[in-house]
Interface confidence: low
């Protein structure tokens, strides 16, 4: 009588993550007696999958009813795949024996290889904001993908960037891969509303690619321009000054005014306009009572913009002369003062 | 002796999200699952997910797809469940749990070590 | 996701009495069925795991069986220290749920 032999008909196999693989094996006869056992991985170190005679396997199912009598079909469906599942699993035919089972003959082996979607990409900024004309480092990482084979792009606002750097881990063979990506983008003043977007195509997403992004807004700061300006006399011994500071992010500025180096008022932006770009105006006037003055009156707008250093910029009144006849911005300087303001 | 100790009581806010911490000791950390489950005042028992300590993977239950984040830091043998956009009706007890296992077994037997439950509360 | 029909939602009866509590599966879950036990403040105590395998240190008045989809909970004998909660749970598809629960108390 011919001897029994297990038959594994493919290869290999290849199924997606989350979906259920079919391992097949038939044996060509129904001597010796003995269960069926699936392993996984060959030799001393292999894993059990699944035992006919014993044990619980809830991922497991046999295609056949493997307690009717002349079956000859071993083949198992394991549910929910994860790329952890991936190696060559072999269909093995014991033998009964007093007091184990003897192994008798193994199939040729079945290769699994999962299909694993990348996770969805997740970009990262730099810590601090930094202004524009620098460069700064955007990341973008994706896990758990399989095969190795992967593609990442970036953009910026829809174009694509060439200045970035990506790795896949591991180098060698691994159950799942990992991506990460660093790219240089060189900020702008309009960059506010600007978004970088790290793009990750890989065979299981079917041509419709991961995306993920970042808000540049979470990024750049764009120092404010200040210009002080006199305005036409409102009482016979009073000049408005204003301080127009100009396309500055984030909101978060304070302003202090100064007359003759004396700390006369400070407030803190609150009704702002917004700008088309996203930067923001903010304009604050000081009310001089010239008669109060003997001497020229120095007057300046000192800015603290996001934390930075304050920046100044100043304006003399001429108190000698009549107000009426006084000229707007006679002498200005922008100090760009160190000093922080203790308020 | 094998036990999982979890952080202590929360108050929130509604749409605020709150990070709960569970501490294993007395077993190898990376060789049993963890899931969590939560239970509402006077409620059933709510599986929430389930992490595998080793590789970090992850299975959440579909209620709490978007919202809940599971993971784990192995220096430390500590899970963490994070649960974000909190409602009123997140207010319940958070408990940690342990899948023991035996042979080849996909998803464990069950879960044979649970932590002591921290009390999650959200109101305005 | 596998609905877990336990009935019944609470239950009194006298010390050393027979005392039983069902559980249904919407679909076949083999023996992958789990049963715990949770006393008022408490977390929840695995009692019987796989149907009917009684967890180390466990009572041997607390029983499980297994038919089809159907699944029985049985303390032989009800004794004080069994005031609680009892909950079924299966544990072969994620996720794994949970019945409703079954409050007993004694009369």
């Known amino acids: 009588e011919e001897e029994l032999q297990v038959i594994q008909p493919d290869k290999s196999v290849l199924v997606a993550a989350g979906e259920t693989a079919t391992l097949r094996c038939t044996a060509t006869s129904l001597i010796p007696v003995g269960p069926i056992q699936w392993f996984r991985g060959a030799g001393p170190g292999r894993e059990l999958i699944y035992n006919q005679k014993e044990g619980h396997f809830p991922r497991v199912t046999t295609v056949s009813d493997l307690t009717k009598r002349n079956n000859m079909d071993f083949s198992i469906r394991i549910g929910n795949i994860t790329p952890a599942d991936a190696g060559t699993y072999y269909c093995v035919k014991f033998r009964k024996g007093s007091p184990d089972d003897v192994e008798f003959k193994s199939g040729a082996g079945t290769e699994l290889s999962v299909r694993a979607k990348p996770s969805a990409p997740v970009v990262s900024g730099p810590a601090a904001r930094a202004t524009p004309q620098h460069t700064v480092s955007f990341t973008c990482e994706s896990h758990g993908f399989s095969p190795r084979d992967i593609t990442l792009k970036w953009f910026k606002n829809g174009n694509e960037l060439s200045d970035f750097q990506t790795n896949v881990d591991p180098v060698g063979e691994s159950v799942s891969y990992s991506i990460h990506s660093t790219a240089k983008v060189v900020l702008t003043r309009e960059d506010v509303h600007s978004q970088v977007i790290c793009e990750v195509a890989h065979v299981t997403l079917q041509g419709d690619p991961l995306r993920g992004t970042a808000n540049l807004s979470e990024t750049i700061r764009v120092p404010p321009t200040l210009e002080v300006t006199q305005q036409p006399v409102r009482a016979e011994n009073q000049v408005n000054v204003t301080c127009q500071v100009r396309k500055f992010y984030p909101q978060r500025l304070q302003l202090t005014w100064l007359e003759n180096g004396n700390v006369s008022r400070t407030e803190t932006a609150s009704t702002v306009t917004e700008n088309k770009d996203g930067t923001y105006n903010w304009m604050s006037w000081l009310l001089v009572n010239v008669s109060a003055h003997r001497d020229d009156v120095k007057l300046t707008c000192q800015v603290e913009h996001d934390g930075q250093p304050a920046v100044s910029k100043s304006h003399d009144l001429k108190v000698s002369a009549h107000p009426k006849e006084q000229g707007s911005n006679t002498a200005a300087e922008n100090t760009g003062s160190n000093e922080r303001n203790i308020y | 002796q094998v036990q999982l100790v979890q952080s202590g009581a929360e108050v929130k806010k509604p749409g605020a999200s709150v990070k709960v911490s569970c501490k294993a000791s007395?077993?190898?950390?990376?060789?049993?699952?963890m899931v969590w489950v939560r239970q509402a005042p006077g409620q059933g028992l709510e599986w929430m997910g389930i992490?595998?300590?080793?590789?970090?993977?992850?299975s959440y239950a579909q209620k709490f797809q978007g919202r809940v984040t599971m993971t784990r830091d192995t220096s430390t043998s500590t899970v963490y469940m994070e649960l974000s956009s909190l409602r009123s009706e997140d207010t319940a007890v958070y408990y940690c749990?342990?899948?023991?296992?035996?042979?080849?077994?996909?998803?464990?037997?069950?879960?044979?070590?649970w932590g002591q439950g921290t009390t999650v509360t959200v109101s305005s | 996701d596998i609905q877990m029909t336990q009935s019944p939602s609470s239950l009194s009866a006298s010390v050393g009495d027979r005392v039983t509590i069902t559980c249904q599966a919407s679909?076949?879950?083999?023996?992958?069925l789990n049963w715990y036990q949770q006393k008022p403040g408490k977390a929840p105590k695995l009692l019987i795991y796989?149907?009917?395998n009684l967890e180390t240190g466990v009572p041997s008045r607390f029983s499980g069986s297994r038919s089809g989809t159907d699944f029985t909970f049985t303390i032989s004998s009800l004794q004080p220290e069994d005031i609680a909660t009892y909950y079924c749970?299966?544990?072969?598809?994620?996720?794994?749920?949970f019945g409703g629960g079954t409050k007993v108390e004694i009369k």
């Open positions: 749970q299966q544990v072969i598809i994620l996720p794994l749920t």
């Open positions: 679909q076949d879950i083999s023996n992958s």
């Open positions: 007395g077993y190898t950390f990376t060789s049993y699952y």
């Open positions: 749990a342990r899948e023991g296992g035996y042979g080849y077994r996909a998803y464990p037997y069950g879960m044979d070590v």
């Open positions: 992490i595998n300590p080793s590789g970090g993977s992850t």
């Open positions: 796989d149907a009917s």
